[in-house]
């Protein structure tokens, strides 16, 4: 028997520092988690230890702090080749910044082979990207060989910026001639890693012939054999073990995200490369875990120009930018509206002809604007100053809901009106009016939301059995503030990018701001 | 663009070693696979051996194990084959090849004559 | 070890034409084959991989087919600069074996 050891992350999201417990800022040093340092102190721990060990990335190591924005992706490169990593697949966020923004800083910086077996590059981007990401890579492991074919979410032209020249295939359609050709080789251990998600994860373990072991992204499941270390609440035990159509046991794997866990997992192979057992637990990277010193000390280095970035300027605004919990709790404030607008402008996607966008609306708890933005300081917008308005270091998400979960939404937004909570929605290609004078639970009398499939974006009732795209706070995608039906009845949910970074890409781009209270949220006569 | 620069040609005495060199350029060395593969004048090719640039990890051809041995310098991307106890058999064209998996050579380099000759 | 056989040393064609270079390995290779051009005093560069995969920036000229042990480099309307020494390859077992050539020349 053979003995290899995955050490793998998943959906990293720009936390080369150590954060929090709930992967925010860290505050209180002795309490924080993960990074980068700690990381690696684990790995070399881990690799003086066991013999055969594989460090792998299933994707989505882009967007999620002030470390992408300032650095777009050589950070990723640069502490990846660090930490040595074997192997990564690419994440939908891999492609934010567009092809070039994956094929300068990471593609041709990258030490390690970078993985999907499921895009096709076409036209005149073929050629500039050929080599510079493979189906699949074969890796001496001691005295072995490992195959390992990645794959990335078929959804990501909805979810990020690929352009029109990258194909996403079916994952399940595209892998199983790369792990053919695997087999033809005569490598008889094969990893998939990839970024689609655990549903995803576990059709790939039950479907492609010859796959030994899932490492997967995306979805940001946990998964725990025994008592759990922390707040997440496993999905299942790890490894989740799924038999496949021709009858072997797959172990698949998912270490939660932000660089929180180390994933751990231990294979045995026979010499056949069939697996015969297989057993681990993601590995909890808390202040018991030292920084590595080295790594820290490059880290800090790295920092510097973070501190500089935050306090440049990004635009301006000539308008006074409402984010008075008075007016965000109550009613449509400008800030509300500016937020939405930049979420929709960040997820424009024309993707189909039918469409002149694929999403149309966005929702906001008003108690996650936390701050206003004085415009008489010349008008200017920093970093910092956004940072103050949204400072929990959230995402905007996409999700899929129905006309009468956004109902219920919009019901519950108003259900004790009047006593300054956070449940309070802002809106954008939504035109909403209550009527308090009515019982909560029954107070929204209008509800009208902006067409996709049309070519004059136009206003239309919303309708109960519809299905909706909406952008949206992770916070509300998780059930936040009582939203418990989004959470409840959402039919899909993709996590976004960092809400700062959308605001001040937004704002960068429109150079100067002059968001107004336009009606989007009314009261109707005489109950307000 | 994609390079593999060998070093120049070697006259060496039966019984003596060489040293021979292949300096990369235009890709990412440590995720490649270096072969070495000989080919006598009016011959074909014979595949000699591979090293795997991040590991330095090898495989030979059985019929050169002990014959030849495959070293990689990352810092200076540069791939060497020590050919030792040489013979007038030995005397070729030697070519080094930059590969990503198990499979074809993609790029390749020049080549180095060997000559061994008394 | 497994024998490529290139079984025409040398075919003689014209610009122009169409010719078909053959390759029988020893036993099933799973199209686990690629096919190399190689002109007077240069190195070998891939053209086919997996059989039939053209290597990126190769004309489309040619193409490659085939199956268990038989396998075929196609070149349609041959150019003058087509005229070289072609090799299979077969990559499906180690020691990775090349078959002994095909010189292609004009008649």
């Known amino acids: 028997a053979w003995e290899l050891t995955i050490l793998h992350t998943n959906d990293v999201h720009s936390r080369l520092e150590q954060t929090s417990e709930d992967s925010s800022k860290c505050v209180n040093a002795s309490r924080c988690m993960g990074g980068v340092a700690r990381l690696f102190t684990k790995v070399q721990q881990i690799r003086r230890a066991e013999p055969n060990v594989l460090l792998l990335d299933a994707g989505d190591q882009y967007q999620g702090t002030i470390w992408f924005t300032v650095y777009k992706g050589a950070e990723v490169a640069h502490f990846m080749n660090a930490l040595r990593y074997d192997a990564m697949a690419l994440g939908n966020h891999e492609f934010d910044n567009g092809v070039e923004g994956l094929i300068e800083p990471l593609l041709k910086e990258a030490k390690f082979p970078i993985l999907s077996a499921n895009i096709k590059a076409k036209g005149p981007l073929a050629s500039q990207i050929s080599g510079l990401y493979l189906p699949y890579k074969v890796l001496p492991v001691g005295d072995e060989v490992v195959g390992i074919v990645g794959y990335t979410s078929k959804e990501t032209p909805f979810l990020s910026n690929p352009g029109t020249n990258l194909v996403f295939e079916d994952e399940i359609t595209a892998l199983q001639p790369e792990v053919d050709k695997l087999k033809t080789l005569n490598v008889n251990k094969i990893i998939a890693l990839g970024h689609s998600g655990f549903e995803m994860d576990k059709l790939i373990a039950q479907k492609v012939r010859g796959v030994d072991v899932v490492v997967g992204g995306h979805s940001n499941t946990f998964l725990y054999t025994g008592n759990p270390p922390s707040k997440e609440v496993p999905a299942g035990k790890y490894p989740f073990i799924v038999t496949s159509d021709d009858g072997r046991k797959v172990p698949v794997v998912q270490a939660y995200a932000f660089g929180k866990y180390l994933g751990y997992l231990k294979i045995e192979f026979d010499e056949r490369g069939n697996v015969i057992s297989s057993h681990g637990n993601p590995i909890l990277l808390n202040s018991s875990i030292p920084e590595d010193p080295s790594i820290k000390a490059d880290i800090n280095k790295w920092r510097i120009k973070l501190d500089n970035y935050s306090t440049q300027e990004l635009g301006k605004t000539i308008v006074y930018l409402d984010g008075s919990s008075q007016s965000c709790r109550f009613r449509e404030c400008n800030m509300g509206n500016l937020i939405c607008d930049a979420m929709i402008n960040n997820n424009l996607r024309h993707t189909d002809e039918m469409f002149w966008n694929h999403v149309s609306m966005c929702i906001l708890n008003g108690g996650g604007i936390r701050s206003p933005i004085d415009e008489r300081n010349n008008g200017t917008i920093t970093w910092e100053n956004l940072a103050a308005v949204l400072p929990f270091g959230g995402t905007f998400d996409l999700v899929q809901l129905k006309g009468s979960t956004l109902k219920k939404a919009f019901e519950h937004s108003v259900h004790r009106y009047g006593q300054s909570t956070g449940e309070f929605l802002q809106v954008g290609g939504i035109h909403v009016v209550y009527d308090l004078s009515r019982k909560p639970g029954d107070r929204v009398v209008k509800l009208d939301v902006l067409c996709t499939k049309c070519r004059v974006p136009s206003y239309d009732p919303l309708k109960m059995d519809e299905v909706y795209k909406v952008i949206l706070p992770n916070f509300l995608a998780n059930g936040g503030d009582g939203f418990q039906m989004i959470k409840d009845e959402l039919l899909r949910h993709d996590s976004g990018d960092q809400d700062i970074n959308v605001v001040s890409t937004y704002i960068s781009k429109m150079k100067v701001i002059y968001p107004a209270v336009e009606g989007r949220i009314k009261f109707s006569t005489g109950s307000h | 663009q994609i390079q593999l620069q060998q070093s120049g040609a070697e006259l060496v005495k039966p019984g003596a070693s060489v040293n021979l060199s292949c300096k990369t350029s235009g890709f990412t060395f440590s995720s490649s696979y270096i072969s070495w593969l000989k080919q006598k004048p009016g011959q074909s090719l014979e595949w000699i051996a591979w090293i795997y640039a991040g590991t330095g990890t090898t495989r030979y051809n059985q019929k050169f194990t002990g014959k030849a041995q495959l070293t990689v310098d990352t810092s200076s991307r540069t791939a060497y084959m020590q050919f030792s106890s040489l013979t007038t058999e030995d005397s070729a064209i030697y070519y080094c090849a930059r590969h990503v998996n198990w499979d074809h050579f993609e790029y390749w380099g020049q080549g180095t004559t060997l000559t061994v000759s008394s | 070890d497994i024998v490529m056989t290139q079984s025409h040393k040398f075919m003689a064609t014209s610009v122009g034409d169409r010719v078909n270079i053959t390759c029988k390995a020893s036993q099933d290779v799973s199209t686990a084959v690629a096919w190399y051009q190689q002109k007077p005093g240069q190195s070998p560069k891939l053209l086919l991989y997996?059989?039939?995969t053209r290597q990126t920036g190769v004309p489309d000229h040619f193409t490659g087919s085939g199956s268990g042990t038989d396998y075929t480099l196609t070149i349609n309307s041959v150019q003058a600069d087509d005229l070289a020494l072609y090799y299979c390859?077969?990559?499906?077992?180690?020691?990775?074996?090349f078959g002994g050539g095909t010189k292609l020349e004009i008649k």
């Open positions: 390859q077969q990559y499906y077992r180690t020691p990775w074996t």
């Open positions: 997996w059989a039939s």
